[in-house]
């Protein structure tokens, strides 16, 4: 099946201090390689989460990514702060032959708006 990375929500709004879920699904796990979430684009983009076993504070996977047929790579960001605002991209990589993995497809992005906490 042809690989497609889908981020269904163009934007989400969340109150500061709350949690939000950023959805991402794939149509294929091939070619093999990791899935990562970034905020922003280009050289300055920030790695938010990687499905490769590392620990990321405040960010967790929603589904059981250890299922060998898992296609859901959604994440939950907890205790959101204004600094978390921005556009988040779910990115599929192809493993590299003894070199850095190659980005092969990105979702369309989900913009996160952080609302002031109601007083």
């Amino acid at each position: 099946k042809e690989l497609k990375v889908t981020q269904p929500e163009k934007s989400v709004s969340v109150a500061a201090g709350d949690s939000t879920v950023l959805n991402c699904t794939l149509t294929s796990l091939l070619p093999v390689g990791p899935i990562k979430w970034y905020r922003g684009v280009g050289q300055s983009r920030l790695l938010i989460y990687s499905f490769t076993g590392e620990h990321f504070p405040r960010v967790t996977n929603v589904s059981d990514a250890t299922k060998r047929n898992n296609m859901d790579f959604s994440i939950r960001i907890s205790n959101v702060t204004p600094e978390d605002a921005g556009t988040y991209y779910c990115v599929k990589f192809q493993k590299g032959p003894s070199e850095p993995d190659t980005e092969i497809q990105s979702g369309g992005g989900t913009e996160v708006y952080v609302l002031a906490k109601p007083s």
């Epitope: 093999v32 990791p34 059981d64 250890t66 060998r68």
Partner: antibody, heavy 118, light 107 residues
Framework: DVQLVESGGGVVRPGESLRLSCAAS????????MSWVRQAPGKGLEWLAG????????YYIDSVKGRFTISRDNSKNSLYLQMNSLTAEDTAVYYC???????????WGLGTLVTVSS | ALTQPASVSANPGETVKITCSGG??????YGWYQQKSPGSAPVTVI????KRPSDIPSRFSGSASGSAATLTITGVRVEDEAVYYC???????????FGAGTTLTVL
């Protein structure tokens, strides 16, 4: 330190059953997929079965499908392998192994010996 | 099936390369496992093609290209004498496979 300790091996007759256990410590067991691998006397390593972190998804090599069942109890940090209808060909050292994110292995137990003999 | 040589030998200080072929680079990740004696616990020396666990010496390295993976031991030592198994995880079939093992003899 990550530690995996298998138990439950022993001598059984052909056709009998055995349940192996693997006690895990030193890591968040409920976050990792796990596998069972065996080694028959004088032979190489053979992957048998794997299970997802939550326990809902299981995977088997064809030769044990229907006879062996992998399961886990995350509340007890334990992995299991139920083996039914054992034959002499199942005689081996059985290892549990922790899986990496891409379903290879990073940590192994010391193994437990299963002998099937009449 | 993954294919690796039955045996290799080297003198201390030499570089040893053990190959493992038969996987599909598009769908396979490789790992390498060291077993010093039959029935003893395997030790992971490489996983994810080229990732070395923190407690494994830097003389061990891994690579994968095309349909093959390679374990390289640079400056082999007597204590590296063991059987080395390659393994593959196939993302098409969700199945793990081991090679038959390569016996490394350090002369």
């Amino acid at each position: 330190d990550v530690q995996l300790v298998e138990s439950g091996g022993g001598v059984v007759r052909p056709g009998e059953s055995l349940r192996l256990s693997c006690a895990a410590s030193g890591f968040t067991f409920s976050s990792y997929a796990m596998s069972w691998v065996r080694q028959a006397p004088g032979k190489g390593l053979e992957w048998l079965a794997g299970i997802s972190a939550g326990g809902s998804d299981t995977y088997y090599i064809d030769s044990v499908k229907g006879r062996f069942t992998i399961s886990r109890d995350n509340s007890k940090n334990s992995l299991y392998l139920q083996m039914n209808s054992l034959t002499a060909e199942d005689t081996a050292v059985y290892y549990c192994a922790r899986e990496t994110w891409n379903h290879l292995f990073d940590y192994w137990g010391l193994g437990t010996l299963v002998t099937v003999s009449s | 099936a993954l294919t690796q040589p039955a045996s290799v030998s080297a003198n201390p200080g030499e570089t040893v390369k053990i190959t493992c072929s038969g996987g599909d680079w598009y769908s396979t990740y490789y790992g390498w496992y060291q077993q010093k004696s039959p029935g003893s616990a395997p030790v992971t020396v490489i996983h994810s093609d080229d990732k070395r666990p923190s407690d494994i010496p830097s003389r061990f390295s891994g690579s994968a290209s095309g349909s093959a993976a390679t374990l390289t031991i640079t400056g082999v030592r007597v204590e590296d004498e063991a059987v080395y198994y390659c393994a593959g995880y196939d993302g098409r079939t969700y199945i793990n496979t081991f090679g038959a093992g390569t016996t490394l003899t350090v002369l």
